[in-house]
């Protein structure tokens, strides 16, 4: 289980993407969750500079909402995953070509660390909004 806490996003990279005042999940498996997750996004965003103008905004939104998941506050703070349909829209519609390239690089082990893998969600493992409309976060 993820252990962490809910807090308002105070970073810069995802400022324009994440909903204002929304709570995000900060994962305490990192020594400094805010800094680590921000670095994760920052690293991935740098690679997005080369993608198409159609793909980029969709990929940025997916990235930010995946690394800084919406957080449901409670006694046990709970990260809410992105809906599968939004992930698939980015993968198969807006960023089809780029996604193939990225997956190819991943299979060939061209990424230096697991950072990039962490930043890309596996769409098939995400909950569908058709199962339960409240079971996932919409972009």
């Amino acid at each position: 289980d993820n252990k962490g806490y809910c807090a308002q996003y105070r970073g810069e990279v995802c400022n324009a993407v994440l909903a204002k005042d929304a709570l995000v999940f900060l994962n305490t498996s990192y020594a400094d969750p805010e800094e680590a997750q921000e670095l994760l996004v920052h690293t991935a965003w740098n690679e997005l500079k080369v993608v198409s103008p159609v793909c980029r905004p969709a990929a940025e939104a997916l990235l930010c909402n995946h690394i800084f998941q919406e957080c449901s506050p409670g006694v046990v703070p709970t990260p809410i995953p992105i809906c599968r349909e939004y992930c698939l829209a980015v993968k198969e519609l807006f960023c089809a070509k780029e996604w193939l390239v990225m997956e190819e690089k991943t299979h060939r082990g061209l990424y230096r660390s697991e950072m990039h893998l962490l930043s890309v969600p596996e769409c098939s493992k995400l909950p569908s909004m058709h199962w339960d409309p409240t079971a996932c976060a919409r972009l």
Epitope: C6, D21, S72, P73, G74, V76, T78, T134
Partner: antibody, heavy 124, light 107 residues
Framework: EVQLVESGGGLVKPGGSLRLSCAAS????????MNWVRQAPGKGLEWVSS????????YYTDSVKGRFTISRDNAKNSLYLQMNSLSAEDTAVYYC?????????????????WGQGTLVTVSS | DIQMTQSPSTLSASVGDRVTITCRAS??????LAWYQQKPGKAPKLLIY???SLESGVPSRFSGSGSGTEFTLTISSLQPDDFATYYC?????????FGQGTKVEIK
């Protein structure tokens, strides 16, 4: 049927201690976070403390930090509140309350079941 | 701590009236707000969570709305059983806090 029954309340002198208990039945106690909420006579509600199902997460309101300790025994389906250094401001009905997540499993639903409360009176 | 302010403190109404209670938060709590009903000598009862989600078993005449800092609880047609005190509660961040309560009494 979900039941929460508080006990352990009573009259105590300022500076004294008291241990409240809450006996739970009708649900899988070990799967739920639990809470204490109090209400001073004629006043509003005040959240006191919360504990997660496995006791990994524990929270207190500022006014009781260092004086109150929340704990649970899942084997006995029981929630506890150890109250030390009590003052007149702690006089209240203390409610044990359960919470849950909605059917999606993600969205928190606070205080969906309550006990009948136990009265704690701090007076010399 | 986030302060919750309810208005009015007391509300006089008749059976069949549409009643609205307002709850304001001192800072944004997005939708993390609950409403409770309490009758004298009884424990509170959860009515609404996540600002607008109706708790199971609660009559549909109760509804919640709002987001950010301003929220409302509406009783579409007041019934004799609805005369009670109502509390809002934020659970956006610890410490969780309640409003001071709104007493709905018979006019």
């Amino acid at each position: 049927e979900v039941q929460l029954v508080e006990s352990g309340g009573g009259l105590v002198k300022p500076g004294g201690s008291l241990r409240l208990s809450c006996a739970a039945s009708g649900f899988t106690f070990s799967s739920y976070s639990m809470n204490w909420v109090r209400q001073a006579p004629g006043k509003g509600l005040e959240w006191v403390s919360s504990i997660s199902s496995s006791s990994s997460y524990i929270y207190y309101t500022d006014s009781v930090k260092g004086r109150f300790t929340i704990s649970r025994d899942n084997a006995k389906n029981s929630l506890y509140l150890q109250m030390n250094s009590l003052s007149a401001e702690d006089t209240a009905v203390y409610y044990c309350a359960r919470d849950r997540y909605d059917r999606s499993g993600y969205y928190y639903v606070p205080f969906d079941q309550w006990g009948q409360g136990t009265l704690v009176t701090v007076s010399s | 701590d986030i302060q919750m302010t309810q208005s009015p403190s007391t509300l006089s109404a008749s059976v069949g009236d549409r009643v609205t209670i307002t709850c304001r938060a001192s800072q944004s709590i997005t939708s993390w707000l609950a409403w409770y009903q309490q009758k004298p000598g009884k424990a509170p009862k959860l009515l609404i969570y996540k600002a607008s989600s109706l708790e199971s078993g609660v009559p549909s005449r109760f509804s919640g709305s709002g987001s950010g800092t301003e929220f409302t609880l509406t009783i579409s047609s007041l019934q004799p059983d609805d005369f009670a005190t109502y509390y809002c509660q934020q659970y956006n961040s610890f410490s969780w806090t309640f409003g001071q309560g709104t007493k709905v009494e018979i006019k």
